[in-house]
């Protein structure tokens, strides 16, 4: 009986540790996509609607803030699209990029952790264009560090929650 009690207590402890594991999945807020034709920071994301969720991490001022030291898997998916019903592209040669950046407040510094994208030729003869970028990686993050997303040509972002999103989840502690 004691073994059973110990076992269930162990399960509970494991479960509560898992539940405390930080994670976040943030989806683009389509009502507040910034303008610009160069690299801009995307600061408006949902954290609590649709597919978006957050636990033991903080979302503030457009940045995802780490609350616990650890090794995290970071990912971002950015979709760009253009349909002729919205008008014409002023230029057919495009650089479509995403940058995942880490900012440290304690030692003021900023580093690009991941970038992805391509130069594209989106011909005016086509009715519809689409391009998707997915980046992901494993990083040591400290409490207080902030993750943010920058993109080129935000006016071409696909505003759907299944198209433009980023997130993180803690995989293990720092030994």
């Amino acid at each position: 009986e004691k073994a059973m009690v110990d076992g269930s207590w162990l399960d509970l402890a494991k479960r509560s540790k898992l539940e405390a594991q930080p994670f976040a999945h943030l989806t683009i807020n389509a009502t507040d996509i910034p303008s610009g034709s160069h690299k801009v920071s995307l600061s408006s994301w949902y954290h609590d609607r649709g597919w978006a969720k957050i636990s033991n991490m903080t979302f503030s001022n457009g940045k995802l803030i780490v609350n616990q030291d650890g090794f995290y898997y970071l990912y971002a998916n950015i979709c760009f699209r253009h349909h002729e019903t919205s008008g014409d592209l002023a230029t057919e040669y495009l650089q479509l990029m995403v940058y995942v950046t880490k900012t440290s407040i304690k030692i003021p510094s900023s580093h690009t952790l991941m970038k992805g994208g391509s130069t594209k030729y989106w011909s005016g003869n086509s009715e519809f264009h689409f391009y998707s970028i997915n980046v992901g990686g494993f990083f040591k993050l400290r409490s207080g560090e902030e993750i943010s997303i920058e993109v080129s040509n935000p006016s071409l972002l696909d505003p759907d929650q299944d198209a433009t999103y980023f997130g993180a989840f803690k995989v293990r502690d720092i030994d």
């Epitope: 303008s35 019903t85 919205s86 008008g87 014409d88």
Partner: antibody, heavy 126, light 103 residues
Framework: QVQLVQSGAEVRKPGASVKVSCKAS????????IHWVRQAPGQRLEWMGW????????KFSQKFQGRITVTRDTAASTAYMELRSLRSEDTAVYYC???????????????????WGQGTLVTVSS | EIVMTQSPSSLSASVGDRVTITCRAS??????LNWYQLKPGKAPRLLIY???SLQSGVPSRFSGSGSGAEFTLTISSLQPEDIATYYC?????FGQGTKVEIK
């Protein structure tokens, strides 16, 4: 305030060419596209083409492809539309119009014409 | 190629009347629809963009609605200065125009 001032009326014989100018003032010319639209007597408005004043990129209606040239002089904040091989059906009022989209803020030419020139009457007659 | 069709082609109404002009697109164009006012010898004027957004400086008696393929321009209380031809437009395509006159 934003103004587009076009050149005066022109009379041409069939087969000739005409070049209409559109001088912009009151805004940063290079940050916007200029469209050319015409209206023949008793007809609907007809889009002809646009020029991105910043980079000089152009797009034309297939109807005018090969007959139309649109250029710009950024120093003079002026756009030009030349139509060649004129025929009587080209008799119309030709307008320049500014696209509402600021190219600094995005790269979509939206076809919302927020300011127009006063129009230039081109008459093609033998 | 999208085709824009306006109705009616002309109408006559009294000052103070509510006037409605309809524009249909041959396929869905979301809300990418604009309305212009043309008076003889004057530069055309953008009234409504994006189906329902009132252009700066345009009187509030003008309003636009619709999405997909069917749109309307409404003048809530017709004024003498509203005598003009009105055109709907989606990117490169214009409607054939609606001439508004006073009875």
């Amino acid at each position: 305030q934003v103004q587009l001032v076009q050149s005066g009326a022109e009379v041409r014989k069939p087969g000739a060419s005409v070049k209409v100018s559109c001088k912009a003032s009151g805004y940063d010319f290079s940050n916007y596209a200029i469209h050319w639209v015409r209206q023949a007597p008793g007809q609907r408005l007809e889009w002809m083409g646009w020029i991105n004043a910043g980079n000089g990129n152009t797009k034309f209606s297939q109807k005018f492809q090969g007959r139309i040239t649109v250029t710009r002089d950024t120093a003079a904040s002026t756009a030009y539309m030349e139509l060649r091989s004129l025929r009587s059906e080209d008799t119309a009022v030709y307008y320049c119009a500014r696209d509402i989209s600021n190219m600094v803020r995005g790269i979509i030419i939206a076809y919302y014409f927020d300011y127009w020139g006063q129009g230039t009457l081109v008459t093609v007659s033998s | 190629e999208i085709v824009m069709t306006q109705s009616p082609s002309s109408l006559s109404a009294s000052v103070g009347d509510r006037v409605t002009i309809t524009c249909r697109a041959s396929q869905s164009i979301s809300r990418y629809l604009n309305w212009y006012q043309l008076k003889p010898g004057k530069a055309p004027r953008l009234l409504i963009y994006g189906a329902s957004s009132l252009q700066s400086g345009v009187p509030s008696r003008f309003s636009g609605s619709g999405s997909g393929a069917e749109f309307t321009l409404t003048i809530s209380s017709l004024q003498p200065e509203d005598i003009a031809t009105y055109y709907c437009q989606h990117t490169r395509a214009f409607g054939q125009g609606t001439k508004v006159e006073i009875k």
